[in-house]
Interface confidence: low
């Protein structure tokens, strides 16, 4: 009932709670002397379903048969309408439409840890839409029973609050859940289990790692477990990896030796526990332990390359370059590099430790036979030294690779190809492809890049430190014993027409011809490798087409003679530059009048 119903009653047959699809009879009846004043025959009783009028009748009572009610709650209200007055609410009723509970499915129970309590979960089945009580019953040995209830249509979990103990681990317990509402009841299938079946150990805790004698090969993982744990599984991985290494151990008693860890690597370790070989379930994984393994002596050898530069008749500059060891080769933090320079005949040697750089430059005499050895050192020791005899890398002309070409290969890649040298190609032990940004001044501070290629290869894709619209000087060296030959070419990964033309800085007269000098185009405006310069000239104030002279680009060249100008005629001159993609705009214009000889 929804109010005091002083004026009348609403009755519902067969019940306020009905099965979905059932029919109900609703009767609204007025109490004596509660009709319309003086006009009892004019009583108009109206039945509302929520706010919608569904039936009416003149008199003291109204009967209505209602079908097709939806799941859930439907509100019916009876009102009285008298002439010349508002409708008066008489009484109302709620009808609850639902279904009997389905059989609860998948009943499963678990006790978290040896000291935990037994809790069970199940699948309710479909919503009954009614007040439904769930009763969970657990029966054990010696006729012991426990019972817990919850009264919520969403109930699918109950904790008994009792702790099963391992005194008799094989004793059977049986759990059953029963759902009851006004329309019926249903019980799950019983679930029978033992202590060992349902106890899920707590995850291991207090995980530690020890490295005996600071060595990665002597590593022991320690942890603490609940007392009855028989099995453990360990998983571990480098922190930057997604794949776990797994190890299963029996009767570990809180320790296990790990034999395959890499040095100087941060690892993540987790452990899980189980009480029985084939009964029960694994615990959750423990919290992660993160630990770095100790360093070990570096393995591998440095990749070393060098450059020679003539200074004067007696001295030369040697620049050594080397690449960092990979993380797996360095096996620790590289503290310094040791460079030893030795004159092989006189036995003089000089050793220097280099920190923070992967290059070293020194000046040595041009005479004598020189060798270098470079190694990397961490806190545990040094790598094997890489030894190189300093020779003239381009001295053996017959070893020079032939037909060297450099072509763009996608974004920021250059494909370098060559043919083996004329001299017996089988004499080649390896090729080295070297590249560096082209700087007109031949700047030795420009970083050097190189890669090594096997003697049977005739191409290499270079991609490291390659930028678009930059010209690279590329050299291919063929090495054979203590001899080397080389060929060079310019190449770029991407090019377009230069952004500006050369700037003419001087025009001088020499024996009836002129010499034009210019400033190089700034590297960032060249937009790739320059192929040609063009010098244009025409008579001042003339509308004729200019004449031009095309000069192949040379890195060091910045002047050129022209001998086809007429004396005592004023000319306007300018220059452009060309890449494979096109011609630049004009550089500056200069006027010049060749004086020549008077007739």
């Amino acid at each position: 009932k929804i109010d005091a119903c002083k004026r009348g009653d609403v009755t519902v047959k067969p019940s306020h709670v009905i099965l979905l699809g059932s029919t109900v009879n609703i009767t609204c009846s007025l109490k004596p002397r509660q009709g319309c004043f003086h006009y009892s025959r004019r009583n108009k009783l109206i039945l509302y379903k929520f706010d919608r009028r569904i039936n009416f009748h003149h008199g003291h009572s109204l009967n209505s048969q209602v079908t097709g009610l939806p799941l859930g709650t439907t509100l019916f209200v009876c009102k009285l309408a008298c002439i010349n007055s508002d409708e008066i609410q008489i009484c109302g009723a709620e009808i609850f439409v639902g279904v009997a509970p389905e059989q609860p499915q998948n009943l499963s129970c678990i006790q978290k840890g040896e000291q935990g309590t037994v809790a069970c979960t199940w699948e309710r089945g479909r919503d009954t839409h009614l007040y439904t009580e769930y009763t969970l019953q657990l029966s054990g040995p010696k006729n012991l029973t426990w019972q817990k209830q919850c009264k919520d249509i969403y109930c699918d979990y109950l904790d008994f609050g009792i702790n099963l103990t391992p005194e008799s681990p094989e004793s059977n317990f049986t759990a059953k859940v029963t759902a009851v509402n006004s329309l019926g009841s249903s019980s799950s299938l019983p679930s029978t289990f033992t202590f060992l079946d349902i106890v899920r150990p707590l995850p291991p805790w207090d995980i530690r790692i020890k490295f005996q004698k600071a060595s990665v090969s002597r590593c022991t993982l320690y942890w603490r477990d609940e007392g009855l744990v028989l099995l453990n599984r360990l998983r571990y991985r480098p922190s930057n990896s997604r794949l776990w290494n797994m190890v299963n151990v029996t009767k570990a008693k809180g320790r296990h030796d790990l034999l395959d860890l890499k040095p100087f690597t941060e690892y993540e370790f987790q452990i899980s526990s189980k009480l029985h070989l084939y009964k029960g379930s694994w615990s959750d994984w423990s919290e992660s332990l993160r630990a770095q393994t100790p360093e070990e002596e570096p393995t591998g050898m440095l990749d070393v390359w060098y450059m020679k530069r003539h200074i004067d008749y007696s001295r030369q500059q040697i620049s050594l370059f080397w690449k960092n060891l990979s993380v797996s080769e360095a096996r620790g933090k590289i503290l310094h590099y040791q460079v030893t320079l030795q004159e092989l005949t006189g036995g003089k040697a000089m050793t220097q430790n280099i920190t923070g750089h992967t290059s070293w430059t020194t000046v040595i005499p041009r005479t004598g036979n020189w060798a270098v050895a470079v190694s990397a050192a961490n806190s545990k020791g040094s790598s094997l030294p890489t030894r190189i005899n300093i020779m003239n890398l381009c001295e053996a002309g017959l070893l020079a690779p032939r037909q060297v070409s450099a072509n763009s290969e996608g974004m920021d890649n250059i494909l370098v190809t060559w043919q083996p040298p004329r001299k017996d190609p089988s004499a080649v032990q390896e090729y080295v492809v070297e590249w560096r940004e082209l700087h007109p001044g031949g700047d030795t501070q420009v970083p050097l890049n190189w890669l090594r290629s096997r003697p049977y290869n005739v191409s290499a894709l270079i991609s490291e430190n390659i930028k678009s619209y930059i010209c690279y000087e590329i050299r291919v060296y063929a090495l054979s014993g203590d001899q080397g030959g080389c060929s060079s070419i310019l190449g770029n990964s991407k090019h377009k027409a230069p952004l500006s033309g050369p700037h003419i800085n001087a025009i001088t007269e020499e024996k009836g011809s002129i010499l034009i000098s210019w400033n190089s185009i700034p590297v960032q405006e060249q937009m790739g490798c320059l192929l040609h310069y063009r010098i244009y000239w025409k008579e001042r104030d003339s509308n004729s087409q200019p004449q031009l002279c095309e000069i192949p680009y040379r890195v060091s060249q910045n002047s050129h003679p022209i001998n086809s100008l007429q004396p005592r005629v004023t000319y306007v001159l300018w220059m452009t530059a060309l890449t494979a993609a096109g011609e630049s705009s004009h550089g500056n214009e200069r006027e010049f009048c060749l004086q020549g000889k008077a007739n």
Epitope: L71, Q105, N106, E123, R124, G125, R126, D127, I153, Y154, D156
Partner: nanobody
């Protein structure tokens, strides 16, 4: 009353993956079975798969078995359809539907429906 809204559709290359979501309003959502259906242009609506109230049970049409996975997060009132190894023939509007009954395959037996989300798989 349950309102459903699908999201996550889009354009994908054959062999790729998509995850559709079906978000619901209403406190009783965890009591509903949720089914996924799809309708390609000019074809009848087709059953894809369904998931039980708790997520413990799933059932799939043969055409998607092994490639599609349905899961649910009742705390977020959301059901998901993870679609892997997509094929051009998976192109369709995908709908989610909810009902209190488990043994429901026919779309007309589902009580509540979403508006659908378009999935296009390019060859």
């Amino acid at each position: 009353q349950v309102q459903l809204e699908e999201s996550g559709g889009g354009l994908v290359q054959a062999g790729g993956s998509l995850r559709l979501s079906c978000a619901a309003s209403g406190r009783t959502f965890s009591s509903y079975v949720v089914g996924w259906f799809r309708q390609a242009p000019g074809k009848e609506r087709e059953f894809v798969g369904r998931i039980s109230w708790s997520g413990a049970r799933t059932y799939y049409a043969d055409s998607v078995e092994g490639r599609f996975t349905i899961s649910r997060d009742n705390a977020k009132n959301t059901v998901y359809l993870q679609m892997n190894s997509l094929k051009p023939e998976d192109t369709a509007v995908y709908y989610c539907a909810a009902d209190l009954k488990w043994e429901v395959l026919l779309s007309e037996h589902y009580e509540y429906w979403g508006q659908g989300t378009q999935v296009t798989v390019e060859p």
